[in-house]
Amino acid sequence: DITPSVPPASYHPKPWLGAQPATVVTPGVNVTLRCRAPQPAWRFGLFKPGEIAPLLFRDVSSELAEFFLEEVTPAQGGIYRCCYRRPDWGPGVWSQPSDVLELLVTEELPRPSLVALPGPVVGPGANVSLRCAGRLRNMSFVLYREGVAAPLQYRHSAQPWADFTLLGARAPGTYSCYYHTPSAPYVLSQRSEVLVISWEGEGPEARPASSAPGMQAPGPPPSDPGAQAPSLSSFRPRGLVLQPLLPQTQDSWDPAPPPSDPGV
């Protein structure tokens, strides 16, 4: 993709490419892509697939080059690689390319699915597992129950899904989930469709979420083990804050209004 003049790996080992503050961000965030070479270099290039010429150059006599992407737009998302070169190398010769870095610029991550395993009908004494499944790995997943303001459970998962276990006696109810990036600046997903868990013999009812006024506005968990609890100031002012620990940042994070209220 980059150039026909890339030599064998043993000659010029690949650099490392990382993103600050994160690889998943909302539009308007300033992103810095850092390319670190294993040896001092003279020129660094940032490449996107299918383009022979570098997208950006940095001429620095060091092991680190920073590429600044100001107030990113969704179009600036995609796959990036970087290479480096030294003046004593032949013309057009670059190092091996770094591993790919995928930058994702989105307002809200895609809606997860929420399913019950083995099913939405719970027998006496049986537990049920709820699987909240998104499309991205290394996300934090949050489970909500109708009528309960705080998150019921949360999990960080290396997989694109997380499983939440509900004890049989307490399982019946209406649930919803979402996921978010594990650290600030947080990017939240759309909320899942609701899932109704019922007792055996009752049968699950299909209920629109708009009839579930107790679902509160989700936000990253207030005390996620292994992640610093986000403060309100770490969120963009995309809406009002309904709960002190549940910042409202996204298009979908209002609770459905009660029937008597035409809107929030």
């Epitope: 539009p27 107030e71 989105t106 307002e107 759309q190 469709e193 209002d254």
Partner: antibody
Framework: EVQLQQSGAELVKPGASVKLSCTAS????????VHWVKQRPDQGLEWIGR????????KYDPKFRGKATITADSSSNTAYLQLSSLTSEDTAVYYC????????????????WGQGTSVTVSS | DIVLTQSPATLSVTPGDSVSLSCRAS??????LHWYQQKSHESPRLLIK???QSISGIPSRFRGSGSGTDFTLSINSVETEDFGVYFC?????????FGGGTKLEIK
């Protein structure tokens, strides 16, 4: 092909209500959000509100509260705008529009618009 | 509410001219600003999103720039099909708001 097909023109009497529809084709409305926008004759655009059709969640401009109610039926891939207690001030063209989205989520620009529904309030 | 002020209200130009339309926000909205074109008796059409991102199918003569509170839509060498009204819209805070529009008309 992505399309938003809106219901036909309405002539209604003051004090009455009207329900406008916006039927999507070429995409599933549950994947995005549907917004409604008002445009009075020879005037600018006014944002009314939006719905997340998958969960029925709505957001309104406060000045349209009590006037507009947005709903959706994902089984028919249709969003609705109901306007109540109509007055001459509600005479306008009403547009539905969807938010742009892709495999990796939403952005907040409105990339496809319906053709508009003209509502005339007159006795 | 964030107020978007567009200027001028009307711009009279000759085809082939290059023009700049302004949209000013009452407070900073970073790059959460989108531009729409509306021709007579038609629906609005998205031209530029996030202040500067071009849209597939929109001619390259349309270019957006700006950040914070001041934004510009530039049209390089206006064509007859470009006449109409141009609106800016912010998606930074609730409620969403539109500018009052700039009418681009033939001189």
């Amino acid at each position: 092909e992505v399309q938003l097909q809106q219901s036909g023109a309405e002539l209604v009497k003051p004090g009455a209500s009207v329900k406008l529809s916006c039927t999507a084709s070429g995409f599933n409305i549950k994947d995005t959000y549907v917004h409604w926008v008002k445009q009075r004759p020879d005037q600018g655009l006014e944002w009314i509100g939006r719905i997340d059709p998958a969960i029925g969640n709505t957001k309104y401009d406060p000045k349209f509260r009590g006037k507009a109610t947005i709903t959706a039926d994902s089984s028919s891939n249709t969003a609705y705008l109901q306007l109540s207690s109509l007055t001459s001030e509600d005479t306008a063209v009403y547009y539905c529009a969807r938010l742009s989205y892709g495999n990796y989520g939403l952005d907040y620009s409105m990339d496809y618009w319906g053709q508009g529904t003209s509502v005339t309030v007159s006795s | 509410d964030i107020v978007l002020t567009q200027s001028p209200a009307t711009l009279s130009v000759t085809p082939g001219d290059s023009v700049s339309l302004s949209c000013r926000a009452s407070q900073s909205i970073t790059n959460n600003l989108h531009w729409y074109q509306q021709k007579s008796h038609e629906s609005p059409r998205l031209l530029i999103k996030y202040a500067s991102q071009s849209i597939s199918g929109i001619p390259s003569r349309f270019r957006g720039s700006g950040s914070g509170t001041d934004f510009t839509l530039s049209i390089n060498s206006v064509e007859t099909e470009d006449f109409g009204v141009y609106f800016c819209q912010q998606s930074n805070t609730w409620p969403r708001t539109f500018g009052g529009g700039t009418k681009l008309e033939i001189k």
